[in-house]
Interface confidence: low
C-alpha cells in the first residue's frame, strides 16, 4: 500500500518516513542477483558512509524488491541532506543514488479515530483521533473524507475536506451572542427557544471544519442523519514535507436530530432553575438531559456527561397524551447549557435531539406584565404597566396587541425599549381587547416572550401607532 502512495515519486530509490524518526527505503531490480550483490550506503555531510541492512522479497512477474529500514533512530536526522546510493558489490558500480532530506519524505500512518459523536450544536460532529506519532502531530495536516451513510445507496455523495487548524476551541464557541439588537427592539434573534427554519442539507462545500490538536469539529451536516468518515494525514509542507498517508478505517456515527423539530424551549424565571419543554410525541416517551460546559476550557477530547433533567409532573392526569413534556434542573451562570432530548418510540428505538447551547442569561423568561389604562379624554387612552423585573428595565421590550370585539385578527404594537407606558388615540364608542407581553432583549439578558396578560377590555379602540 505504501508503494502505491509513492507512485508519483519518480526516483528509482524510494524512501519514506512514518514518524520522522524512522526511514524506510526500497528499490526494485528486474534481475535476480545473487544474495549480497547490493549494498545500500548512506552518509550525512562530512560523515563516513554506513551500510543499511537489506532485506529482499520476490516480486511476482517482475524481480526482487530490496528494502532497508534504518536500524537506529539516531541515524535519522531532520534538516540535513542524506546521500543514499546503491552499490553493486560485485561489479563495483553505483546502481542508483539520491540525496534527500528525511523531513521531506513523510508518509504518515493513518490516525485512528477513537471517537465520533454529535457536537454541541445540531448538525455538528465532533471527531477525536489518536496520532500514531503524537510528537509530530503539530507538523501534520489532516484531511477528512465523509458522506451520508445510506444502506440503499453505497455511492452517496462524498466530501473530502482539509481540516483547518485553529487556535481556538471550536466546539466551545460562545453560543448565539445577542448582537442583533440594532434591529427593532423586539426583533427575534435566533435563540435556542425559537422555532426557526430547519437546516437544509449542506452542499459539498458548505460544511465547515475546524481542528484542535487531535480533535475536529464539522458543522453544517444534516441533523438526524448517519455519516461515515475517514481521516488521513500529510506533513504540512512547511516544517515537514511528504505525501498523504493512507486513509484510516471508516467509522460511522448517527447525528442527533435538531430539537427545533420538537419545539424545544428552555427558560429560567430566577436565573437559578431552568425549565425546558418540548412537544410530546404520540406513542413515545421522552427524557431530557443537560450538561454544562465552560466557555474557555478546551479539552483535547470532549466527552460530556449528560445529567438527567428532572421530569415535572404531568399537568393533565388521565389517558390523554399531554401536549408538552417539561423538565427542570439547577443551572449556573458561568457555563454554557446544553440540552438533549431522547425520544423512545414504542418498538424501543431511541432518537436523540440536540438543542442549541445557551447561557442562562439568554433564557430569562419574565413574568406576565400587568396592563393598566385610563381614559384621559374622549378617544384618548393612557396605558401604563409595571416592569416585571425592575433590575432589567432598560433591557425589557414589550408587545401590545389589540383587537376589536368580534374580530379575529390582532394588531401588534411595539413600544420603545424600556418604555413604562404610552398613549393611544382611540375611536370612541368601540369595544376592544388589549393584551401585553414582555421579554428581555438587551446586552445582558435575553429570553423568550412571557405569556400574554389577561385580556383588558376597553370601551374604545385605536388604529393609531405609538
Amino acid at each position: 500500500q505504501d508503494v502505491s502512495l509513492l507512485a508519483s515519486d519518480s526516483e528509482p530509490l524510494k524512501c519514506f518516513s512514518r514518524t520522522f524518526e524512522d526511514l524506510t527505503c526500497f528499490w526494485d531490480e528486474e534481475e535476480a542477483a545473487p544474495s549480497g550483490t547490493y549494498q545500500l550506503l548512506y552518509a550525512y555531510p562530512r560523515e563516513k558512509p554506513r551500510a543499511c541492512p537489506l532485506s529482499s522479497q520476490s516480486m511476482p512477474h517482475f524481480g526482487t524488491r530490496y528494502v532497508c529500514q534504518f536500524p537506529d533512530q539516531e541515524e535519522v536526522r531532520l534538516f540535513f541532506p542524506l546521500h543514499l546510493w546503491v552499490k553493486n558489490v560485485f561489479l563495483n558500480q553505483t546502481r542508483t543514488q539520491r540525496v534527500l532530506f528525511v523531513d521531506s519524505v513523510g508518509l504518515p500512518a493513518p490516525p485512528s479515530i477513537i471517537k465520533a459523536m454529535g457536537g454541541s450544536q445540531p448538525g455538528e460532529l465532533q471527531i477525536s483521533w489518536e496520532e500514531p506519532a503524537p510528537e509530530i502531530s503539530d507538523f501534520l495536516r489532516y484531511e477528512l473524507r465523509y458522506g451520508p451513510r445510506d444502506p440503499k445507496n453505497s455511492t452517496g455523495p462524498t466530501v473530502i475536506q482539509l481540516i483547518a487548524t485553529e487556535t481556538c476551541c471550536p466546539a466551545l464557541q460562545r453560543p448565539h451572542s445577542a448582537s442583533a439588537l440594532d434591529q427593532s427592539p423586539c426583533a427575534q434573534p435566533t435563540m435556542p427557544w425559537q422555532d426557526g427554519p430547519k437546516q437544509t442539507s449542506p452542499s459539498r462545500e458548505a460544511s465547515a471544519l475546524t481542528a484542535e490538536g487531535g480533535s475536529c469539529l464539522i458543522s453544517g451536516l444534516q441533523p438526524g442523519n448517519s455519516y461515515w468518515l475517514q481521516l488521513r494525514s500529510e506533513p504540512d509542507g512547511i516544517s515537514l514535507g511528504g505525501s498523504w498517508g493512507s486513509w484510516s478505517l471508516p467509522v460511522t456515527v448517527d447525528l442527533p436530530g435538531d430539537a427545533v423539530a420538537l419545539g424545544l424551549q428552555c427558560f429560567t424565571l430566577d436565573l437559578k432553575n431552568v425549565t425546558c419543554q418540548w412537544q410530546q410525541q404520540d406513542h413515545a416517551s421522552s427524557q431530557g438531559f443537560f450538561y454544562h460546559s465552560r466557555a474557555r476550557c478546551c479539552p483535547r477530547d470532549r466527552y460530556p456527561i449528560w445529567e438527567n433533567c428532572e421530569e415535572e409532573e404531568k399537568t393533565n392526569p388521565g389517558l390523554q397524551t399531554p401536549q408538552f413534556s417539561r423538565c427542570h434542573f439547577k443551572s449556573r451562570n458561568d457555563s454554557i447549557i446544553h440540552i438533549l432530548v431522547e425520544v423512545t418510540t414504542a418498538p424501543g428505538t431511541v432518537h436523540s435531539y440536540l438543542g442549541s447551547p445557551f447561557w442562562i442569561h439568554q433564557a430569562v423568561r419574565l413574568p406576565t406584565p400587568n396592563l393598566h389604562w385610563r381614559e384621559i379624554s374622549s378617544g384618548h387612552l393612557e396605558l401604563e404597566w409595571q416592569h416585571p423585573s425592575s433590575w432589567a428595565a432598560q433591557e425589557t421590550c414589550y408587545q401590545l396587541r389589540y383587537t376589536g370585539e368580534g374580530h379575529q385578527d390582532w394588531k401588534v404594537l411595539e413600544p420603545p425599549l424600556g418604555a413604562r407606558g404610552g398613549t393611544l388615540e382611540l375611536r370612541p364608542r368601540s369595544r376592544y381587547r388589549l393584551q401585553l407581553r414582555a421579554r428581555l432583549n438587551g446586552p445582558t439578558y435575553q429570553g423568550p416572550w412571557s405569556s400574554w396578560s389577561d385580556p383588558t377590555r376597553v370601551e374604545t379602540a385605536t388604529e393609531t401607532a405609538w
Epitope: 534538516f79 541532506p81 521531506s104 512547511i238 516544517s239
Partner: antibody, heavy 118, light 107 residues
Framework: QVQLQESGPGLVKPSQTLSLTCTVS?????????WNWIRQPPGNGLEWIGY???????SYNPSLKSRVLISVDTSKNQVSLKLSSVTAADTAVYYC???????????WGQGTTVTVSS | DVVMTQSPSSLSASVGDRVTITCMAS??????LAWYQQKPGNAPKLLIY???SLETGVPSRFSGSGSGTDFTLTISSLQPEDFATYYC?????????FGGGTKVEIK
C-alpha cells in the same frame, strides 16, 4: 529575543588568518539550531561559508573548505570563524546568521567589515 | 553545487508598480527556496520561506511562487521602503547558494 553580534579586526594582512567571533545572546547555541557564516564582497552578492550545528557538526562551502574552520566557545556562547591564507578576494562584510526551523537564515548579525590589505 | 540564477540583475520601477523577480535553480530544489531583502548597510532580512510562505511581519504585498527549478518573487504595489536588493537562496542541498541579487531602484 535572539541577537547576534559579529566582532573582529577590521584589517587583516594577506596570507594571515582572519578570525571573527559571533556572540549570540538570548539563546544557547548548544541547545538547538545551526549557526552560519555568510560573506558579501563589496558590491557583490552573498556567499555561504559554512555552518556549525548545535551539536558541533560542521559543513563548509567546498570552495573555501581547505581554509575554513568554524568552532564554538560554549562558555561565551560564541561561534568563531577562522579563514586562513587570506587574499584581497576575501575582503567582505562577514555576517553570522542562525539557520532556523525552516532552513532559512531567520536571525542575522549586523555584519562586520574585513579588509585584507598590506 | 546548485547554481541559482536571478534575473534581472537590476530594474527601475515607480511607487505603485507591480514588480516581478525570477530565480532559476540548476536542479530541482523542491520548494526549499527563500527570498531576502537587503538595504544598503544592513543585513539581509527574510521575506519568504518555502518558496511561497510569508515570514511573520512581512507585508502581504510580497508573495512568492514556484517549485522545482523556477521561482518568482512579486511585489504587488511597490512602496518607497521596498527599494533594495533582493536575493533568492536555495537550502535544498549543501552548499547553500544564493542568487546574484536584483537591485530595485527608483525610476
Amino acid at each position: 529575543q535572539v541577537q547576534l553580534q559579529e566582532s573582529g579586526p577590521g584589517l587583516v594582512k594577506p596570507s594571515q588568518t582572519l578570525s571573527l567571533t559571533c556572540t549570540v545572546s538570548g539563546y544557547s547555541i548548544t541547545s538547538d539550531y545551526t549557526w552560519n557564516w555568510i560573506r558579501q564582497p563589496p558590491g557583490n552578492g552573498l556567499e555561504w561559508i559554512g555552518y556549525i550545528t548545535y551539536s558541533g557538526s560542521t559543513s563548509y562551502n567546498p570552495s573555501l573548505k581547505s581554509r575554513v574552520l568554524i568552532s564554538v566557545d560554549t562558555s561565551k556562547n560564541q561561534v568563531s570563524l577562522k579563514l586562513s591564507s587570506v587574499t584581497a578576494a576575501d575582503t567582505a562584510v562577514y555576517y553570522c546568521a542562525r539557520l532556523g526551523r525552516r532552513y532559512t537564515m531567520d536571525y542575522w548579525g549586523q555584519g562586520t567589515t574585513v579588509t585584507v590589505s598590506s | 553545487d546548485v547554481v541559482m540564477t536571478q534575473s534581472p540583475s537590476s530594474l527601475s520601477a515607480s511607487v505603485g508598480d507591480r514588480v516581478t523577480i525570477t530565480c532559476m535553480a540548476s536542479e530541482d530544489i523542491y520548494i526549499r527556496l527563500a527570498w531576502y531583502q537587503q538595504k544598503p548597510g544592513n543585513a539581509p532580512k527574510l521575506l519568504i520561506y518555502a518558496a511561497t510562505s510569508l515570514e511573520t511581519g512581512v507585508p502581504s504585498r510580497f508573495s512568492g511562487s514556484g517549485s522545482g527549478t523556477d521561482f518568482t518573487l512579486t511585489i504587488s504595489s511597490l512602496q518607497p521602503e521596498d527599494f533594495a536588493t533582493y536575493y533568492c537562496q536555495q537550502y535544498w542541498s549543501s552548499p547553500w547558494t544564493f542568487g546574484g541579487g536584483t537591485k530595485v531602484e527608483i525610476k
